[in-house]
Amino acid sequence: SDKLYQRKEPVISSVHTKVKGIAEVTENVTEGGVTKLGHSIFDTADYTFPLQGNSFFVMTNYVKSEGQVQTLCPEYPRRGAQCSSDRRCKKGWMDPQSKGIQTGRCVPYDKTRKTCEVSAWCPTEEEKEAPRPALLRSAENFTVLIKNNIHFPGHNYTTRNILPTMNGSCTFHKTWDPQCSIFRLGDIFQEAGENFTEVAVQGGIMGIEIYWDCNLDSWSHHCRPRYSFRRLDDKNTDESFVPGYNFRYAKYYKENNVEKRTLIKAFGIRFDILVFGTGGKF
C-alpha cells in the first residue's frame, strides 16, 4: 500500500546472467553428393552471445552458408535481382540488398535464371526459410541464473535477489518457489502465455521484469523482488516483414592458405531484464 509519509526513491540496479544447458542438434549434412544426418552438441559458448546492457541471447535456430570464399560469383536471384544482359549490371554498384559489389557482367545463376555477377563472399547467401521445427528447440530446458544487485543511495541501502539461504538447485515457480533466481526458459514462456516451440523458429524478444517494492522502515522491513514475464516483440507482424529476431555472424578459418568463413544466420530469443521499483523510508 502507498505510504505517504515515506520518502521514495527509484531503484538503481545491476544485472548479471548465466545460462546453462546442452543441446543435441541433428541436421542434414551433404558431402560429395551424399546427404546424411549429422549430430552435434551445442554448449553455452555455442548458443549464447554477450550483449550490452541487461540482455542475454539464446540461439534457438540457424541457417548456415558454409565455406564461403571471397571471389566472383552470381548474386542470389532474390526478387528484382535478375538480369538478361550486362546492361542491367553496373560495375562498382553496391545495392544495399545485395551481398557484394557488381562487376558489370550478367551471368547464369542456374539453368533458367541470370543475375549480376558480384565480388563477394561466395556463394552468396541463399534466402532460406528458418528450419521448422527449430534446431535447438531443446533450449526450452536451458536455465538462466539472474543475479540482480540493487541500491537505494538516498537510503544507503543495498541488497540482491540471491539470498545466502538460497538453494543452487532450485527452479523458479510462481507459487512454489517465487524467490528462486534460476529460471527454466520454457517456464518463462509459459508464464508469459507464449509457445516456446513456435517462437524458437523465427526468434523473439522476451521481457523478464523484476519489480522491487521496498519498505525500508525497520519496523516493517520488506525488500524482495517480484518476477513477471511478457513478450516484447510484435508477434503479429506480417510474415513478409522481418518477423522474429535474428542476426548474422561468421566463423573464419583457413584451408590450404585460403581464408574461408561459415556464415550463420542465428535466430533466437533475446531476453531483456527490466528492473524497476522504489524504496520507501520514513
Epitope: 551433404t30 560429395g32 565455406g67 564461403q68 570464399v69 560469383c73 547464369p108 561466395c122 574461408k260
Partner: nanobody, 127 residues
Framework: EVQLVESGGGLVQAGGSLRLSCAAS????????MGWFRQAPGKLREFVAS????????RYIDSVEGRFTISRDNTKNTLYLQMNNLKAEDTAVYYC????????????????????YGQGTQVTVSS
C-alpha cells in the same frame, strides 16, 4: 549412372601440347561442376583444374596456371583440358570427374567432393 571416358593422352616432348577430352554419358552433367585430377606413380591423386557448371568460372592448381586451360561444351556433354608448354613433372594419369558438392567455390579442389572418376588417360612428357 554416369560414365566418364577420357581420351587425348599420349607421349609428348617437353614444351609440347596435348588436348584431353572427357565424354560423359548416362546422364547430363551440364548441371555440375567438373574437374581434372592427376596421379603420378607413387603419389596421391591431385587436383589440376575445375570449371563450374556454366563454364564461366575456372580454377587451377598453381603449377599449371597459365599453361593449362579447362573448358566445357555442355551441348556435347564434354569436358576439355588444353595443356601447353608441358613439363616432365606433368607426367601422370589424368582423370576427369564431376563435382557433387557442396559449394563449388570453396570445395572445387577437394577430391571427396567429386564422384564418378573416369578410367584415366596417360600423359607422358619426355625431357
Amino acid at each position: 549412372e554416369v560414365q566418364l571416358v577420357e581420351s587425348g593422352g599420349g607421349l609428348v616432348q617437353a614444351g609440347g601440347s596435348l588436348r584431353l577430352s572427357c565424354a560423359a554419358s548416362g546422364r547430363t552433367v551440364s548441371d555440375y561442376g567438373m574437374g581434372w585430377f592427376r596421379q603420378a606413380p607413387g603419389k596421391l591423386r591431385e587436383f589440376v583444374a575445375s570449371i563450374n557448371w556454366s563454364g564461366i568460372y575456372t580454377r587451377y592448381i598453381d603449377s599449371v596456371e597459365g599453361r593449362f586451360t579447362i573448358s566445357r561444351d555442355n551441348t556435347k556433354n564434354t569436358l576439355y583440358l588444353q595443356m601447353n608448354n608441358l613439363k616432365a613433372e606433368d607426367t601422370a594419369v589424368y582423370y576427369c570427374a564431376y563435382f557433387l558438392g557442396p559449394n563449388w567455390y570453396s570445395n572445387y579442389g577437394r577430391p571427396s567432393s567429386y564422384g564418378f572418376y573416369g578410367q584415366g588417360t596417360q600423359v607422358t612428357v619426355s625431357s
